[in-house]
Amino acid sequence: PEEPQLRMKNNEEAEDYDDDLTDSEMDVVRFDDDNSPSFIQIRSVAKKHPKTWVHYIAAEEEDWDYAPLVLAPDDRSYKSQYLNNGPQRIGRKYKKVRFMAYTDETFKTREAIQHESGILGPLLYGEVGDTLLIIFKNQASRPYNIYPHGITDVRPLYSRRLPKGVKHLKDFPILPGEIFKYKWTVTVEDGPTKSDPRCLTRYYSSFVNMERDLASGLIGPLLICYKESVDQRGNQIMSDKRNVILFSVFDENRSWYLTENIQRFLPNPAGVQLEDPEFQASNIMHSINGYVFDSLQLSVCLHEVAYWYILSIGAQTDFLSVFFSGYTFKHKMVYEDTLTLFPFSGETVFMSMENPGLWILGCHNSDFRNRGMTALLKVSSCDKNTGDYYEDSYEDISAYLLSKNNAIEPR
């Protein structure tokens, strides 16, 4: 059955919502990435008008394996400290919480998940003038929310009013089982300047208790682009492939689920020494997209133009120097071989994938590399004939979301 809907009549505050979304110049698109090919044969056509992108996103708990591709390491290896389960080690699997995309408001059918996205939530994006309707359901066991870093106009969907006693939507928790509908509008101030790349790399997270919510896994990528940078499907024009990379130190000691992870994964939970520095160190996971020790293996087609949206978010407090072995990339109009990322920031770079082979993606900080912050990048020929080109993907927003009198009823 559908989620029950709240119906509204004669409400005096929805003009801003009505006016925004029934504008004849605004197209409405429900983003669905299920069928997106990995490359295109024809360059995308830019869209002319602002769009409203509708996303159904849930916070969901699950067991996360940081190293699904790594065999049990030798006990003397560096990896073993992080990956082996034992009396004082949780190992590679931890209960975490993730942002998951769904196809509609029933929150029954998940959107397809790409392995390389890892722990990241769905890729959200919009151009200046676009609106993102975020239908968020908290399917976890504790309060969380979803809030963008990089969009300033964020409000509840049907009016600007916040509940009495709430100063800012960023701090407002959505409780277990609850659905909350947000409206994010991308303003000129949010968008790139002339000296920026076409799309800025930003993120969204839960901000109820940002440090702990983030340590627990709630993070996703957000691209903010200037007008006519993305096509009808949201793919950046002049790019064949978009890749999101999150360099993140997940401090599982700060996760909301630490106690539960100890209870579930340690053979003798009562015997664990929580203050033991080695135990604490074993719970600090130096990851790329939530994977450690080359468990993230990216594939890119030879000769593709690839945009890379790279984030540094997590417990790391210093800058990261990121490299792609075998490659230089263009960053702010300059070719570079190392990208400097400051904490809680993102950068956009692109490169032409001209060197076939298996390459390393990592950071110059050897301490982080030794602790697992490396991934593999495979560049090889692709059969272009198997790809289908992008077509416009429109779907009228459901009548219950957009009807002029705001009557919201089950379909």
Partner: antibody, heavy 117, light 105 residues
Framework: QVQLQESGPGLVKPSETLSLTCTVS????????WSWIRQPPGKGLEWIGY???????NYNPSLKSRVTMSVDTSKNQFSLKLGSVTAADTAVYYC???????????WGQGTTVTVSS | EIVLTQSPGTLSLSPGERATLSCRAS???????LAWYQQKPGQAPRVVIY???NRATGIPDRFSGSGSGTEFTLTISRLDPEDFAVYYC??????FGQGTRLEIK
Amino acid sequence: QVQLQESGPGLVKPSETLSLTCTVSGDSISDYYWSWIRQPPGKGLEWIGYFFYSGGSNYNPSLKSRVTMSVDTSKNQFSLKLGSVTAADTAVYYCARSQLRYYLDVWGQGTTVTVSS
Amino acid sequence: EIVLTQSPGTLSLSPGERATLSCRASQSVDSNYLAWYQQKPGQAPRVVIYGASNRATGIPDRFSGSGSGTEFTLTISRLDPEDFAVYYCQQYGSFFGQGTRLEIK
């Protein structure tokens, strides 16, 4: 001082839809979360659902396929519709104001609904 | 869905005695969202404790709440005749426990 008053038919036939309205006086319906709770005869409290006018809602999973909540800000009223009722839906129905879902601080006096043919 | 289990089902005590009511959650609950209600026959419930340990307006100081995680307690230090009623705990503004009936012995 805030007051809540439930109203609606006291008798509903099986398979029909139960409709109740809660009229709020002394407060703006736009500023709070609002809840419906019921209590079958001789039993405990059962949460039905709550909503916030600007875009928040949460419903008891065991009831949500039958529940519709609506709000009319011009009348400062909110309503509950419960479809396909059976005798098990016989109860005292309460509306209540929720302080940010921390707790229910103001309750209506309750209205008894009997489902019977 | 988090299930709240209250114990005992019925508590028989005399005025002046101390009452201890328990509420156990099937999963950890943020204590900000744990409330206790009192209901007397023929009346609507009223909140006595919110945020696990904060007394609601007009509630006498003999009522206190404590606990965190999965274990919460409502304590009435010296029972007054008017305290005999049914008490419910509630989490996250939604589900209630099944109730504890506090009756005069």
